[in-house]
C-alpha cells in the first residue's frame, strides 16, 4: 500500500518509516501483517496520514519524498502523539520555584556559553509564567540537564549525529523533568551545528509539561529549525500552552510580597513563613529574607537567605532544630534541606516522604522538635504528625487534628518554634500564641513581631 515496489532502497524506507511511526506516532509494529510489503490493513497508512497531518505535510498516506525528508529531519525524541500531557491536568510542577542543575558540559562550547544558553532558555518560560528557575551546583535539582551519547541511563538511547537531538521527561520525581542532549550533535551558540539555546527552550517546554505543537511557528514543533536567537520569541501557541498549565506572570501577585522587597518588620500585619531556634538565636523566615534575633538582645538583623545559604530556595515554609546534633531542617514544597553547623549538607534536598508522610502530603506548614520527648511535630493543614527522631519513623496513630490536641491553636498554623524548655510559640497570620505544653494551654497571645520590640 504505501509502496508497491520492493527495491532494497524502498524496503529500507519502509523499515525506517515503520520505526519512525512506532517511536513518534504509536504504530504497533507487532500488529502489522507479516508480509510487510503488502499491507492489507490500513494501520501503516493511517499512521502516515496522522504524521503528515500533524507536521503540516500534504496528507497522502504514502511514504512520499516530502514525508521521508521530514522523517529524516533532526528532531526531538519525544513522541508527537499520545500527547505529553499523559494525565488530565498534568503532569505539571505543583510549585513555582524550580531548581535545575547542569550535570556535565558539552566540550563543543565554553562552559559559560552553556550556562548562559540554558539560563536564557529557562528565562524564556519564566517571562510568560509565574515560574522562577534557579541553578544549583550540588544536590538534587528538579530538572537535571545532561549531555550524553548513545545509551545513557534511560531506555531511550541516542542515535548518533542527526536524527534525535535531545529529549526530556515531563514533570515528576526522579528522572521527571530531566533534559538530555545528544553529545553526538555539535552544539553551538549560533546557526552552525545545533543551537543549544533553541533546543533547550524546546526541551524545557517538555520538562514543564508541554507536548509537541503542530504549529510550525511554535518552538514546541517537533523538528529543529534555526531562527535568529536575538529576535527569538515564543509563538502564541507556546504561550497559550504553558499558561494553560501555570497561568501568566501576574499570578505571582497573589503572593503578599510580590516584588520580594524587604518586608517592614514592625508592620502590624506581618506574618512569617517559618521560625526556628538555631542555638541561642531565633531565625524568622519570610519570602527571601530571614531575621536573626539573638536571645535576650533587642538588636535584630535582616539577611537574604541566599547570602547565608546560596543553594537554598527562598520561601522556606517550615523549619526545626535538633540542637544536640547541631542540625536544622528546612522545608519547602515536597523537599527538605539539612543544615549541620550552619552548613548545608551535600545530597540535599531530599523528599519529605522519606519521613514517612503519605503521598498526598505535598508540603509542610510548620515543624518543631521537642527535645524532652525527642519527637518532631509536623503541621500540615489542620492536622499534625509526630516523628520519633531516635527510631527515625512516624509514631503510630497520626495524623491528629491540631485543634483537638493543642487547645486554642489552629485549625492551621504558619510557623512554630520551641523555647525556654516548656513553650511552643505558634504563629497564625499576624498573631502569635505562647503555649505551655506541660499545662497544655495558651499562656500568652502576642503579635507575630513581638520579638523585635515593635
Amino acid at each position: 500500500l504505501p509502496l508497491n515496489s520492493s527495491t532494497s532502497l524502498e524496503k529500507n524506507n519502509v523499515l525506517f518509516g515503520e520505526r519512525y511511526l512506532e517511536k513518534f506516532y504509536g504504530l504497533e509494529i507487532n500488529k502489522l501483517p507479516v508480509t510487510k510489503m503488502k499491507y492489507s490493513g490500513n494501520l501503516m497508512k493511517e499512521k502516515i496520514q496522522e504524521m503528515q497531518h500533524f507536521l503540516g505535510l500534504k496528507v497522502t498516506g504514502q511514504l512520499d519524498t516530502s514525508t521521508l525528508e521530514m522523517m529524516h529531519a533532526p528532531r526531538c525524541g519525544v513522541p508527537d502523539v499520545h500527547h505529553f500531557r499523559e494525565m488530565p491536568g498534568g503532569p505539571v510542577w505543583r510549585k513555582h520555584y524550580i531548581t535545575y542543575r547542569i550535570n556535565n558540559y558539552t566540550p563543543d562550547m565554553n562552559r559559560e556559553d552553556v550556562d548562559y544558553a540554558i539560563r536564557k532558555a529557562f528565562q524564556v518560560w519564566s517571562n510568560v509564567t509565574p515560574l522562577k528557575f534557579s541553578k544549583i551546583n550540588t544536590g538534587m535539582a528538579d530538572i537535571l540537564v545532561v549531555f550524553a551519547r548513545g545509551a545513557h541511563g534511560d531506555f531511550h538511547a541516542f542515535d548518533g549525529k542527526g536524527g534525535i537531538l535531545a529529549h526530556a521527561f515531563g514533570p515528576g520525581s526522579g528522572i521527571g523533568g530531566d533534559a538530555h542532549f545528544d553529545e553526538d550533535e555539535f552544539w553551538t551558540t549560533h546557526s552552525g551545528g545545533t543551537n543549544l539555546f533553541l533546543t533547550a527552550v524546546h526541551e524545557i517546554g517538555h520538562s514543564l509539561g508541554l507536548g509537541h505543537s503542530s504549529d510550525p511557528k511554535a518552538v514546541m514543533f517537533p523538528t529543529y529549525k534555526y531562527v535568529d536567537i536575538n529576535t527569538f520569541r515564543l509563538s502564541a501557541d507556546d504561550i497559550r500552552g504553558i499558561q494553560s498549565l501555570y497561568g501568566d506572570p501576574k499570578e505571582n501577585q497573589r503572593l503578599p510580597n510580590p516584588d520580594n522587597s524587604e518586608p517592614a518588620l514592625c508592620d502590624p500585619n506581618l506574618s512569617f513563613d517559618a521560625v526556628t531556634t538555631v542555638g541561642n538565636k531565633i531565625f524568622f523566615f519570610k519570602d527571601r529574607f530571614f531575621w536573626l534575633k539573638v536571645s535576650e538582645r533587642p538588636k535584630t538583623s535582616v539577611n537574604l537567605i541566599s547570602s547565608l545559604w546560596p543553594t537554598l530556595p527562598s520561601g522556606i515554609e517550615a523549619a526545626y532544630e535538633i540542637e544536640a546534633r547541631n542540625q536544622v531542617f528546612l522545608f519547602k514544597d515536597d523537599k527538605y534541606w539539612l543544615i549541620s553547623n550552619l552548613r548545608p549538607e551535600p545530597n540535599y534536598p531530599k523528599s519529605i516522604h522519606s519521613f514517612g508522610f503519605p503521598n498526598f502530603v505535598k508540603k509542610i506548614d510548620a515543624a518543631v522538635f521537642n527535645p524532652r520527648f525527642y519527637r518532631t511535630y509536623f503541621f500540615v493543614d489542620n492536622q499534625y504528625w509526630r516523628y520519633d527522631e531516635r527510631r527515625q519513623m512516624m509514631d503510630p496513630g497520626y495524623p491528629k487534628l491540631i485543634t483537638k490536641n493543642f487547645q486554642g491553636i489552629g485549625p492551621k498554623i504558619d510557623a512554630v518554634f520551641y523555647s525556654k524548655n516548656k513553650y511552643y510559640y505558634f504563629f497564625q497570620g499576624s498573631n502569635q500564641f505562647e503555649y505551655d505544653f506541660l499545662l497544655q494551654r495558651i499562656t500568652k497571645t502576642l503579635k507575630s513581631n513581638s520579638w523585635f520590640g515593635c
Epitope: 513522541p79 499520545h82 494525565m87 550535570n103 545532561v146 550524553a148 534511560d154
Partner: antibody, heavy 122, light 103 residues
C-alpha cells in the same frame, strides 16, 4: 489499590511457545509503561521487555530479542508477552511490573505482580 | 553497554547493625539508580529511587546516596524484617543482588 496479576505460565517443551498475560487494576493502565522482569530459580532479577503507554515503542533484552514479543491491550487493561522458540534458560518466574511513566519509560518499577512460573523442559 | 556491579554478594549482620551495600556502574548514570528489596517467594519491592529518594511507606532507616558511577544503600539500624536480598537497578539492568543474612 494497584494490582497486577500474571497468568499463562506452565510447563512447555524447548522450541515451544507460551503467552503470558498480566491483568492490571487500580490505576489508569493506558497512562503507564509496563515491563516484564524474570527470575530464574535461585538467581537474580533480569529485565526482559518494556512497552510504552501507547503500545508503539517496545524494548527487549538481547537474550530474548527476536523470540519474545511484548504487547498491550489498553481497552482490556492487559499486558502480554508472547514467547516463542523457548529454551531451557528461559525457565523463570515472570513478573509484570508497572513503570512510573508512560510516553517514555523511566525504568522505575513501583508496583509488581506476584509472578507466574514458566518451566521449559523436555 | 551499561553494566552494574553490586557488592558484596552476601553479607551477615546482626539486628541493630549499620549495613552498607554498594553498586557501581561502568559509566555515569547520573542519579538514575533504584534499589529493591526481595524476600523469598515474594515480588521485589521498591525502596529507593533516583539514588536517594525514599519510596513512600519505606522506613527512614533505609537511605541511598551517590551519583555518577558509585552508589550506596545504607540501613542505619537493622531490624529483623530487613533480612532479604537487595538489588540495585538502572533502566533495564539489575545488579547481581546482595543477600543479607542474620549473623
Amino acid at each position: 489499590e494497584v494490582q497486577l496479576l500474571e497468568s499463562g505460565g506452565g510447563l512447555v517443551q524447548p522450541g515451544g511457545s507460551l503467552r503470558l498475560s498480566c491483568a492490571a487494576s487500580g490505576f489508569t493502565f493506558s497512562w503507564y509503561g509496563m515491563h516484564w522482569v524474570r527470575q530464574a530459580p535461585g538467581k537474580g532479577l533480569e529485565w526482559v521487555s518494556g512497552i510504552v503507554s501507547s503500545g508503539g515503542e517496545t524494548f527487549y533484552a538481547d537474550s530474548v530479542k527476536g523470540r519474545f514479543t511484548i504487547s498491550r491491550d489498553n481497552s482490556k487493561n492487559t499486558l502480554y508477552l508472547q514467547m516463542n522458540s523457548l529454551r531451557a534458560e528461559d525457565t523463570a518466574v515472570y513478573y509484570c511490573a508497572k513503570d512510573i511513566r508512560g510516553v517514555f519509560l523511566s525504568g522505575l518499577f513501583d508496583h509488581w505482580g506476584r509472578g507466574t512460573l514458566v518451566t521449559v523442559s523436555s | 553497554d551499561i553494566q552494574m556491579t553490586q557488592s558484596p554478594s552476601s553479607l551477615s549482620a546482626s539486628v541493630g547493625d549499620r549495613v552498607t551495600i554498594t553498586c557501581r556502574a561502568n559509566q555515569s548514570i547520573y542519579t538514575y539508580l533504584n534499589w529493591y528489596q526481595q524476600k523469598p517467594g515474594k515480588a521485589p519491592k521498591l525502596l529507593i529511587y533516583a539514588a536517594s529518594s525514599l519510596q513512600s511507606g519505606v522506613p527512614s532507616r533505609f537511605s541511598g546516596s551517590g551519583s555518577g558511577t558509585d552508589f550506596t544503600l545504607t540501613i542505619s539500624s537493622l531490624q529483623p524484617e530487613d533480612f532479604a536480598t537487595y538489588y540495585c537497578q538502572q533502566a533495564g539492568i539489575f545488579g547481581q543482588g546482595t543477600k543479607l543474612e542474620i549473623k
